[in-house]
Interface confidence: low
């Protein structure tokens, strides 16, 4: 079989929801020594980077200028050292945000509510579009789809102190086109005082730690590069 | 909508020098890369040099024929783009393009989406 | 630098006949080629980049295809306002270079 490197990890900086006309960066974190990055946009080759010198970066960053629909879509990376490739990234959606309108969000039966409650948000846009998406802030990769012609429901069923926190919601036109954010609605859960330690549907790290961790090397990165390499892909 | 409005071509004597100019409206100038592209009398289109987006450091790059005689530079505040020529010679005789780099330029190469008007420069005893 | 050849340099065609073009790098470039089209006076006008891809308000009778080292354009039904230049261009390395172009012109 043909021999390939371990596959590179692509990250958003800051975010994978870029408001329309910002740019965005995204990140490809391989190998100290690769001599040539490449990021793939829905299968096609659109940029490509040469880090200098090679042996001392272990990634490289793709600047995105103006996001709009065009170029919002999948996102890969691969890299290679001497004639050897890697394996590709796993795909990242890029989205972008601020389109069109902005819906409004609303809970019942209302932002305050005690645990073992049934809630279940509304998100509403009256401007042609069918996917609803619900995000708790802190938790921007958990997306919840909903359907509906002008409203859509979220249902969270009977809710614990896990799902206090602060929740938006988007409008999508297709999947990497979204409208503006909802204003936020923070959701209070009271009661359950023994579960409110961090739950397993916490995050452990909030979304602005999802940034490109590109170090320069040292002599001890040089040791650590593998140790780097499958921490990475561990706390994934 | 996007829009690159060139200007300052002109004669020039063998061993002068010229500056060209390209206003730029309807994008954020400073996160594109630009370029001038250049095309010879009933010739092809060659590459002359381009300069990185903010993103990228601003800095510039240059075909061999022109390296250290052209220099391109940016005014993000006024969104304009310069081509200082200098000891010109009779094969820079030509029809001077700006463009502006697509979306995915990267550190090494990108293509070209908006193009400027065009300005000549001849090269003349 | 990566050179890029064009082929044929000029060719004769009539309304409504399919035109193909082709463009060979010197060396693999992927699929990092972009298309223009030059009318005489005017700055050309990228029709295809990534090889393949419709760059936004042109006709879908231009497509491109090809990857690595081999290119075509095609023109599926020739137009009268498509007779013109057309340039491909290699845009994986620095410097980008242009083939040296193709003349379109009427039968």
């Known amino acids: 079989p043909k021999q390939t490197l371990p596959k590179p990890i692509i990250r958003a900086e800051s975010t994978y929801m870029v408001p329309k006309e910002k740019q965005a960066t995204l990140c490809c974190q391989g190998s100290y020594g690769a001599v040539e990055y490449q990021l793939h946009f829905e299968g096609s080759l659109f940029a490509v980077e040469r880090p200098k010198p090679p042996e001392r970066i272990n990634g490289v960053k793709f600047h995105i200028p103006d996001m709009n629909s065009r170029k919002a879509g999948r996102y890969s990376c691969i890299y290679r050292v001497g004639e050897l490739w890697s394996e590709r990234s796993d795909l990242l959606d890029l989205v972008v945000t601020e389109m069109y309108d902005t819906p409004t969000l609303s809970v019942h039966p209302g932002p305050e509510v005690t645990s073992g409650e049934k809630v279940t948000f509304y998100c509403r846009l009256d401007t042609a579009t069918s996917m609803f998406l619900l995000l708790k802030e802190g938790r921007s990769r958990d997306v919840q789809r909903s359907y509906g012609k002008v409203q859509a429901e979220f249902p969270m069923g009977p809710v614990t102190t896990a799902h206090r926190g602060s929740y938006r919601c988007f409008g999508s036109y297709n999947n990497y086109a979204w409208s503006f954010p909802s204003e936020p609605v923070k959701l209070l859960v009271t009661g359950d005082i023994e579960n409110t330690s961090l739950a397993p549907t916490d995050p452990t790290f909030p979304d602005s730690w999802d940034t490109c961790l590109l170090t320069r090397e040292t002599g001890l990165q040089k040791d650590l590069a593998l140790w780097d390499h499958t921490a990475q892909n561990l706390l994934r | 909508q996007v829009q690159l409005v060139q200007s300052g071509g002109g004669l020039v004597k063998p061993g002068g020098s010229l500056r060209l100019s390209c206003a730029a409206s309807g994008f954020t100038f400073s996160d594109y890369y630009m370029s001038w592209i250049r095309q010879a009398p009933g010739k092809g289109l060659e590459w002359v040099g381009f300069i990185r987006s903010e993103a990228y450091g601003g800095t510039t790059e240059y075909a061999a024929s022109v390296k250290g005689r052209f220099t391109i530079s940016r005014d993000n505040s006024k969104n304009t783009l310069y081509l200082q020529m200098n000891s010109l010679r009779a094969e820079d005789t030509a029809l001077y393009y700006c463009a502006r780099g697509d979306r995915y330029c990267s550190s090494t190469s990108c293509w070209f989406d908006y193009w400027g008007q065009g300005t000549l420069v001849t090269v003349s005893s | 630098d990566i050179q890029m050849t064009q082929s044929p340099s000029s060719l004769s065609a009539s309304v409504g006949d399919r035109v193909t073009i082709t463009c060979r790098a010197s060396?693999?470039?992927?699929?990092?080629l972009a298309w223009y089209q030059q009318k005489p006076g005017k700055a050309p006008k990228l029709l295809i980049y990534a090889a393949s891809r419709l760059e936004s308000g042109v006709p879908s009778r231009f497509s491109g295809s090809g990857s690595g080292t081999d290119f075509t354009l095609t023109i599926s039904s020739l137009q009268p306002e498509d007779f013109a230049t057309y340039y491909c261009q290699q845009h994986y390395s620095t410097p980008p270079t242009f083939g040296q172009g193709t003349k379109v012109e009427i039968k």
């Open positions: 060396q693999g470039i992927s699929n990092a």
